[in-house]
């Protein structure tokens, strides 16, 4: 999806919130792991 | 997902069409407004998303415009109506948006509203 | 612009046969597209997204494929409830865009 159509404002939009979304998942677990270890 | 605010109107009447979504947030998910004339197929309007920004068809023009009035509801304004514009509008949820597939569908459909535009 | 074009606009099948409806798209897509059925009085209903995933709940009967601008719906063992309107929409871009649907497939059961 890197190029073509793919450009598109709303795509564009789609893109970042999938983005954010999949860091705080990341970054959620991280920090579960992190507490749990302790 | 239902809509309401459909009726019989003269050609140039203002009319704002009201989705009222529940079971969910608009706060998370992306709303659309599709419209289909008798008989004839399925013809995107636009798009809300999340933050309230807006997207629409190449068609609309400035005509209609799409806004959220409360965290349940999602209103279509329409105006400079003609008779073209005589046709069932549905409101649809948007799909989720993921890594690897942002693109978008729609996924859950309310029943429609029909505006009928007549002299 | 992204154009969607859809056939045959009417196909005709018997019960148990087998139904093929094309979609093409005028630019790359990708795997970008969704497949919809309608019924006469009621709203749409997602089948297919990402030209090949079945939405929850629908029938294996519903096949999607291809990626880029040529796509597909087989409809395998056709039943009377199949009788509908389908149509595909890709879901590539929605700014400024003109129709992201195609123009529909009338599939009628013998």
């Known amino acids: 999806h890197s190029d073509g159509i793919f450009t598109d404002s709303y795509s564009r939009y789609r893109k970042q919130m999938a983005v954010k979304k999949y860091l705080a998942a990341v970054l959620g677990k991280r920090y579960k792991q992190r507490v749990k270890n302790k | 997902v239902e809509e309401s605010g459909g009726r019989l109107v003269t050609p140039g009447t203002p009319l704002t069409l009201t989705c009222t979504v529940s079971?969910?947030?608009?706060?998370?998910?992306?709303m659309s407004w599709v419209r289909q004339a008798p008989g004839k197929g399925l013809e995107y309007i636009g798009i809300?998303?999340?933050?309230?920004?807006t997207w629409y068809a190449s068609w609309v023009k400035g005509r209609f415009t799409i806004s959220k009035t409360s965290s349940t509801t999602v209103d279509l304004k329409m105006t400079s109506l003609t008779t073209e514009d005589t046709a069932t509008y549905f409101c649809a949820r948007i799909s989720d948006a993921y890594v690897f597939d942002y693109a978008y569908y729609f996924t859950l459909w309310g029943q429609g509203t029909l505006v009928t535009v007549s002299s | 612009a992204l154009v969607m074009t859809q056939t045959p606009s009417s196909v005709s099948a018997a019960v148990g046969g087998t139904v093929t409806i094309n979609c093409l798209a005028s630019q790359n897509i990708y795997n970008s597209l969704a497949w919809y059925q309608q019924k006469p009085g009621q709203p749409p209903k997602l089948l297919i997204y990402?030209?090949?995933t079945l939405a929850s709940g629908v029938s294996s009967r519903f096949k999607g494929s291809g990626s880029g601008t040529q796509f597909t719906l087989t409809i395998s063992g056709v039943e009377c409830a199949d009788a509908a309107t389908y149509y595909c929409q890709q879901g590539a871009g929605a700014d400024n865009i003109g129709n992201p649907f195609g123009g529909g497939t009338e599939v009628v059961v013998k």
């Open positions: 990402r030209a090949s």
């Open positions: 079971g969910f947030s608009l706060s998370s998910y992306d």
């Open positions: 809300i998303n999340t933050n309230d920004d």
